[in-house]
Amino acid sequence: MRTEAQVPALQPPEPGLEGAMGHRTLVLPWVLLTLCVTAGTPEVWVQVRMEATELSSFTIRCGFLGSGSISLVTVSWGGPNGAGGTTLAVLHPERGIRQWAPARQARWETQSSISLILEGSGASSPCANTTFCCKFASFPEGSWEACGSLPPSSDPGLSAPPTPAPILRADLAGILGVSGVLLFGCVYLLHLLRRHKHRPAPRLQPSRTSPQAPRARAWAPSQASQAALHVPYATINTSCRPATLDTAHPHGGPSWWASLPTHAAHRPQGPAAWASTPIPARGSFVSVENGLYAQAGERPPHTGPGLTLFPDPRGPRAMEGPLGVR
């Protein structure tokens, strides 16, 4: 069962005694306001569930709520992938999937969500307060990340509700594309609101699920108003992040299309049909400069063919053969 976090609906003030024309002029600002707040505001949700049957087994599900085309998904644990986290799986819509122990099976669930089953014991076993992060790279929105973990009091078999992603940063591709239009709309909106100064402007209230959580930093100017609508959850620092990570043994994963939901309306015509597949995102209120993996010169040293230490915050990297888990 999944309960989605609700975003409170914005209610415009009553038009009062204004005439039809006045009412009509007020409709446009609210339409624009809704656009300013919602358009170009992709979200990443993260759901972590501990299996009732196996206490050391976790299922992480991540989804991308945006209209863009997904280019890559990265799932990490122990924190954001670029900030101390260790990569568990990387998924590309055409080139495939690669995963590392204790990840057992990473797969696309839909065109915009993925799931990852983790299991293990000992050093590589996840524990209840582990933080899992998902990063989605998409066009035109850019890179979006969010993290989630099981609440300390979670009963096995229950899942943490999906966590909406905080607004961290959209890459220039998303900013330039959507924000120009939005900026114009928002400026016009402010202009219209100014003309109705006698009417108090409505206050945008963030979701009240975690009122004391620090607010996500808005990296893009166009997101200033968006950030006010989302309060990130507090990320729990994990004390059981593994020091070592075994290289995942190659195994045959499910066929590419097998991960389509049974209710899918149509079978995609080819890998490109996965254009909106999601990409896991980074930490909630951790301010992450999005270097798009481009920091050069650092790679995890290898201690042997089967055992790898990952002091590098970006963790292990891996590749998949086309359309499958290698």
Partner: antibody, heavy 122, light 107 residues
Framework: QVQLVQSGAEVKKPGASVKVSCKAS????????IYWVRQAPGQGLEWMGH????????DYAQKLQGRVTMTTDTSTSTAYMELRSLRSDDTAVYYC???????????????WGQGTLVTVSS | DIQMTQSPSSLSASVGDRVTITCQAS??????LNWYQQKPGKAPKLLIY???SLHTGVPSRFSGSGSGTDFTFTISSLQPEDIATYYC?????????FGGGTKVEIK
């Protein structure tokens, strides 16, 4: 089929600039990066830099920093590589190749463009 | 930068021979290594990715192995159409670097 088609050969004078285009077809352009590699006559392959089509983010070889600019036009699925302040040792065949949207994962180059010969001569 | 040392720089073998090319990385690159074939006047073509995975459509006589710093590329039975220069390429770190190439000729 997946294809990269590059612009034609260029002859330039030292100090000039050249802009090579690379038009992609047969795949979702923004799912990948475009990587630029050059090959001087009789020499090996040299990575020049790359651009991630979904974001426009770039990485350039240190020796070319400040002289090279890589861009994309997602509406036409075309990548561009501009090299300025040309010198005689920039004479080479310039290739574009399809690679990953992150250099760290899934990053093999396939396919390659047919190459564009740029000759720098006074 | 990670240096890729490819050897030999050239070799001559008979049709049907087993040909082996090695590539050594100056630092650990796990299996982030690809092999390409380039024929004169043509663009390179991908043969092997991630050290050992055979690219779609590539004949099975080509194979790759290795991990960490030492990699091997093998043509199990050399064919006349295999006359080309072969390059290894790493992407374990930026900058992406290529080996110097191995020119394969027929005796």
């Amino acid at each position: 089929q997946v294809q990269l088609v590059q612009s034609g050969a260029e002859v330039k004078k030292p100090g000039a600039s050249v802009k090579v285009s690379c038009k992609a077809s047969g795949y979702t352009f923004t799912h990948y990066g475009i990587y630029w590699v050059r090959q001087a006559p009789g020499q090996g392959l040299e990575w020049m830099g790359h651009i991630y089509a979904y974001s426009g983010d770039t990485d350039y070889a240190q020796k070319l920093q400040g002289r090279v600019t890589m861009t994309t036009d997602t509406s036409t699925s075309t990548a561009y590589m501009e090299l300025r302040s040309l010198r005689s040792d920039d004479t080479a065949v310039y290739y574009c190749a399809r690679g990953s949207p992150t250099y760290e994962h899934f990053n093999w180059f396939d396919p390659w463009g047919q190459g564009t010969l740029v000759t720098v001569s006074s | 930068d990670i240096q890729m040392t490819q050897s030999p720089s050239s070799l001559s073998a008979s049709v049907g021979d087993r040909v082996t090319i090695t590539c050594q990385a100056s630092d650990d690159i796990s299996d982030y290594l690809n092999w390409y074939q380039q024929k004169p006047g043509k663009a390179p073509k991908l043969l092997i990715y991630d050290a050992s995975s055979l690219h779609t459509g590539v004949p099975s006589r080509f194979s790759g192995s290795g991990s960490g710093t030492d990699f091997t590329f093998t043509i199990s039975s050399l064919q006349p159409e295999d006359i080309a220069t072969y390059y290894c390429q790493q992407y374990g770190n930026l900058p992406i670097t290529f080996g110097g190439g191995t020119k394969v000729e027929i005796k």
